[in-house]
């Protein structure tokens, strides 16, 4: 499906006429798109510990380990985004993998991702059964990094 950007509103073909309760096929294809985390998410409850693993995915081996948290909006493309959540306030020692080093801080690395929101077309709410895709930047934390603390002057 091609996108046309028009005055801040991205239209699917014909600005997407659709019937209530019957989503057009294009929308179902679009809305089911998601940005998956590098590793599958576990939906079980578990206490995520502040430690660097010896094996496993990057996010658990890092000295600033993080977990992924779901951000779901059915009216957004992509529908699912994953935010990195730092598991430690400081960085983990490379030697032990568990002791924290107060000389380093574990902080999220942010990225402004382009997303599209499904909206009524401007000035047409409640009239034509059409919708528009509005392009926006959305802040997502990609990973956690180990940084030296800022020194206040």
């Amino acid at each position: 499906v091609s996108l046309r950007i028009q005055e801040g509103c991205s239209h699917l073909p014909s600005c997407c006429p659709s019937k209530e309760q019957e989503p057009p096929e294009e929308w179902l294809k679009w809305s089911s798109a998601s940005v998956s985390p590098p590793e599958p998410l576990s939906h079980t409850h578990h206490a995520e510990s502040c430690r660097a693993s010896k094996d496993g995915p990057l996010n658990s081996r890092a000295i600033s380990p993080w977990s992924y948290e779901l951000d779901r909006d059915l009216n957004r493309v992509p529908q699912d985004l994953y935010h990195a959540r730092c598991l430690c306030p400081h960085c983990v020692s490379l030697q032990t993998g568990s002791h924290m080093d107060p000389l380093g801080n574990s902080v999220p690395l942010y990225h402004n991702q382009t997303v599209f929101y499904r909206r009524p077309c401007h000035g047409e709410e409640g009239t034509h059964r059409r919708y528009c895709l509005e392009r926006r930047l959305y802040r997502v934390s990609l990973a956690c990094v180990c940084v030296r603390p800022r020194v206040m002057a």
Partner: antibody, heavy 125, light 108 residues
Framework: QVTLKESGPTLLKPTQTLTLTCTFS??????????LGWIRQPPGKALEWLAH???????HYKPALKSRLTITKDTSKNQVVLTITNVDPVDTATYYC?????????????????WGQGTLVTVSS | DIQLTQSPSFLSASVGDRVTITCSAS?????MYWYQQKPGKAPKPLIY???NLASGVPSRFSGSGSGTEYTLTISSMQPEDFATYYC???????????FGQGTKLEIK
């Protein structure tokens, strides 16, 4: 038409596990965008959202209660089950299940558009 | 977590009165939803996506607002409108549904 009905014990003792079942008809929980949530209301108090399960089995829980809650679905039986472990008298409430997933021309709604009649659960020693 | 604060918590009104209930969010949100609940009954959807009336809801009900401030207005109170009203929002990250503490509308 869409109907939902909650079932479960009416009286529990503290520390026991509460298992509530929502049996629904008139829609399918395998339809993209569909979801079902549990909401409770202590006597004379406000509504409190507890948990939600989507068509694709993704689950969300109220953060403060996450360790005690589990939500599951059986699409073939048209049922959603909520379990609450280690109940306390403060868990005494009317428990509702409600559907979410109404699709309009402009997108999905996050309103609970259909509700069950609720089931009163009392926790007392 | 986003908090919702409804005001007032209690409101006495007469038939024919114009009534406004406010719902304030602790941070900016896209949409607000409103429900009506009568004693011993399940909540009933009233307004979805801030300003759209749910099916079968009389036109005397209306919703408006943006950002952190949202309102539910009843243009002319009717006897069947005396009930408790709740606002609700959905937050996508982390995915949570939040309700206001309710506004009880009583007959003056």
């Amino acid at each position: 038409q869409v109907t939902l009905k909650e079932s479960g014990p009416t009286l529990l003792k503290p520390t026991q596990t509460l298992t509530l079942t929502c049996t629904f008809s008139g829609f399918s929980l395998s339809t993209s965008g569909m979801g079902l949530g549990w909401i409770r209301q202590p006597p004379g108090k406000a509504l409190e959202w507890l948990a939600h399960i989507w068509w694709d089995d993704v689950k969300h829980y109220k953060p403060a209660l996450k360790s005690r809650l589990t939500i599951t679905k059986d699409t073939s039986k048209n049922q959603v089950v909520l379990t609450i472990t280690n109940v306390d008298p403060v868990d005494t409430a009317t428990y509702y299940c409600a559907r979410m997933g109404q699709l309009h021309y402009y997108g999905y709604d996050y309103a609970m558009d259909y509700w069950g009649q609720g089931t009163l659960v009392t926790v007392s020693s | 977590d986003i908090q919702l604060t409804q005001s007032p918590s209690f409101l006495s009104a007469s038939v024919g009165d114009r009534v406004t209930i406010t719902c304030s969010a602790s941070s900016s949100v896209s949409y607000m939803y409103w429900y009506q609940q009568k004693p011993g009954k399940a909540p009933k959807p009233l307004i979805y996506r801030t300003s759209n009336l749910a099916s079968g809801v009389p036109s005397r009900f209306s919703g408006s607002g943006s950002g952190t401030e949202y309102t539910l207005t009843i243009s002319s109170m009717q006897p069947e409108d005396f009930a408790t009203y709740y606002c609700q929002l959905y937050h996508s990250y982390p995915p949570t549904w939040t309700f206001g503490q309710g506004t009880k509308l009583e007959i003056k």
